[in-house]
């Protein structure tokens, strides 16, 4: 006869491990008992369980409540046991020693491998600001046994670096993602992808990038100066900028206070029917926590009568 077992039994932390040991004997051979022991190198054999044909299952006090025989129906030549709720400390070498009649004793060893799936964590780096050099965007750490694989999935251009720390029964892997911040990265996803044999599918943690910036400010509304004449209604100036975080807008007049009747509505400056009093230099001040920008424009309200007089003069001068 001969023993049938596995070289390696792999189980995920918390699952039950079946330790196989089957005696394939000739007809008429019987198994008297199967002794299971843990036999890690450098240590004596530690009893796990004893399966006896008459006495039944004996479980070592160290494994009380954790070792069982597989559910019926059971083959009397099957000396397999179930190790319930595998923990990392269970990882190691095991031996089954089978006493048979009349063939004698046989033994076989197997290695129990307990996979510890990682619980990854993602930590954003310092605040990203446009204009910085290469900056840490995020780091992702995962600890498991064996060491997990940590990669990044993103459209953003950057560089990665990884380091590993080995512990007694596991390894922690940390991967960092560095980039040169630019406004185009704002709102882009940066995903940490953790792979491990103990996971049914990769674990993914997504971080949305926030890059602080403030664009140059400009003012729209003066494209056609001829529209800015006395009596015109609905004239307005709009301050154009963008930023992260979203900026706030403030309007002032450089050569004095804002004329009465002028309404400030965020990025827009609304005028009442235009008069010459509205002529002047207007300043849009844009700011966020990152920076501030100014843009100024000169408003020159035209008097149509003056214009026509000038035209007449010009005509008459000719």
């Amino acid at each position: 006869g001969e023993l049938e077992t596995s070289d390696v039994v792999t189980v995920v932390l918390g699952q039950d491990a079946k330790l196989p040991c089957f005696y394939r004997g000739d007809s008429g051979e019987q198994v008297g008992q199967v002794a299971w022991a843990r036999v890690d190198a450098g240590e004596g054999a530690q009893e796990l369980a004893l399966l006896h044909s008459k006495y039944g299952l004996h479980v070592s006090p160290a494994y009380e409540g954790r070792v069982e025989q597989p559910p019926p129906p059971r083959n009397p030549l099957d000396g397999s046991v179930l190790l319930r709720n595998a923990v990392q400390a269970d990882e190691g070498e095991y031996e089954c020693r089978v006493s048979t009649f009349p063939a004698g004793s046989f033994q076989a060893r197997l290695r129990l491998r307990v996979l510890v799936p990682p619980l990854p964590s993602l930590n954003p780096g310092p605040a990203l600001e446009e204009g910085q050099g290469l900056t840490l965007a995020a780091s992702c750490t995962a600890e498991g046994s064996p060491a997990p694989s940590v990669t990044w999935d993103t459209e953003v251009k950057g560089t990665t670096s990884s380091r590993s720390f080995k512990h007694s029964r596991s390894a922690a892997v940390t991967s960092e993602f560095h980039l040169v911040p630019s406004r185009s990265m704002n709102g882009q996803p940066l995903t940490c992808v953790v792979s491990h044999p103990g996971l049914l599918q990769d674990q993914r943690i997504t971080h949305i990038l926030h890059v602080s910036f403030l664009a140059e400010a400009s003012v729209r509304g003066l494209e056609d100066q001829n529209l800015w004449h006395i009596g015109r209604e609905g004239a307005m100036l709009k301050c154009l900028s963008e930023g992260q975080p979203p900026p706030s807008y403030n309007w002032t007049r450089l050569d004095g206070p804002l004329p009465s009747g002028v309404r400030v509505d965020g990025d827009t400056l609304g005028f009442p029917p235009l008069t010459t009093e509205h002529s002047g230099i207007y300043v849009c001040h844009v700011s966020n926590e990152f920076s501030s920008r100014d843009s100024q424009v000169t408003v020159d309200v035209l008097d149509p009568q003056e214009d026509s007089g000038k035209q007449v003069d010009l005509v008459s001068a000719s």
Partner: antibody
């Protein structure tokens, strides 16, 4: 024929010592675990101590730990129990019994017993 | 330690009677249970081992059953030489422990 014969019992004062012997014959002595079991007058059976065939594994009942010492001489097919600091409650018939080692520290039931030797602890 | 509780502590029966003695372990012991017979002034004698296996030379009127925590010794037809004290013993853990005994007396 398997035979176990105890000797060495007798009357001893509290605090005294006694050494019991158990001579074995009719079987391969060194391959069996051997135990001492006692029975106080009119009482039930109480396991005292056990020694493995190679003397590597020795166990005691809490009631005798530190006072009794079990040993064996496989060349003489003899089991011993050295009893020190004896107390009145150690008064009992002491039996030796054999059991087969299955594996680790797991034994069969004791299938053969000696006739017993009486130890009386009294002043 | 595992406690072994035997019942009854004594019983009176007649020759030919069927006698049942029970033994309960305080925790599971698989079939690591033995039954012994002891007569006054004599050493215990192994009757049943592994809960239900008859020791060589023991009459077949003795039988044992059970596993785990509950066990039974049955004498199918009591004979005059069966009047004695019977003990159960677990040897699943150390220390091995005995029941307190059941004395079978003549009615």
């Amino acid at each position: 024929e398997v035979q176990l014969v105890e000797s060495g019992g007798g009357l001893v004062q509290p605090g005294g010592s006694l050494r019991l012997s158990c001579a074995a014959s009719g079987f391969s002595f060194g391959t069996y675990g051997m135990s001492w079991v006692r029975q106080a007058p009119g009482k039930g059976l109480e396991w005292v101590s056990r020694i493995s065939g190679d003397s590597a594994n020795i166990r005691y009942a809490d009631s005798v730990k530190g006072r009794f010492t079990i040993s064996r001489d496989n060349s003489k097919n003899t089991l011993y129990l050295q009893m020190n600091s004896l107390r009145a409650e150690d008064t009992a018939v002491y039996y030796c019994a054999r059991a087969e080692l299955l594996a680790f520290d797991v034994y069969t039931a004791s299938d053969y017993w000696g006739q017993g030797t009486l130890v009386t602890v009294s002043s | 330690d595992i406690q072994m509780t035997q019942s009854p502590s004594s019983l009176s029966a007649s020759v030919g009677d069927r006698v049942t003695i029970t033994c309960r372990a305080s925790q599971g012991i698989s079939s690591y249970l033995a039954w012994y017979q002891q007569k006054p002034g004599k050493a215990p004698k192994l009757l049943i081992y592994a809960a239900s296996s008859l020791q060589s030379g023991v009459p077949s009127r003795f039988s044992g059953s059970g596993s785990g925590t509950d066990f039974t010794l049955t004498i199918s037809s009591l004979q005059p030489e069966d009047f004695a004290t019977y003990y159960c013993q677990q040897h699943y853990t150390t220390p091995p422990t005995f029941g307190q005994g059941t004395k079978v007396e003549i009615k």
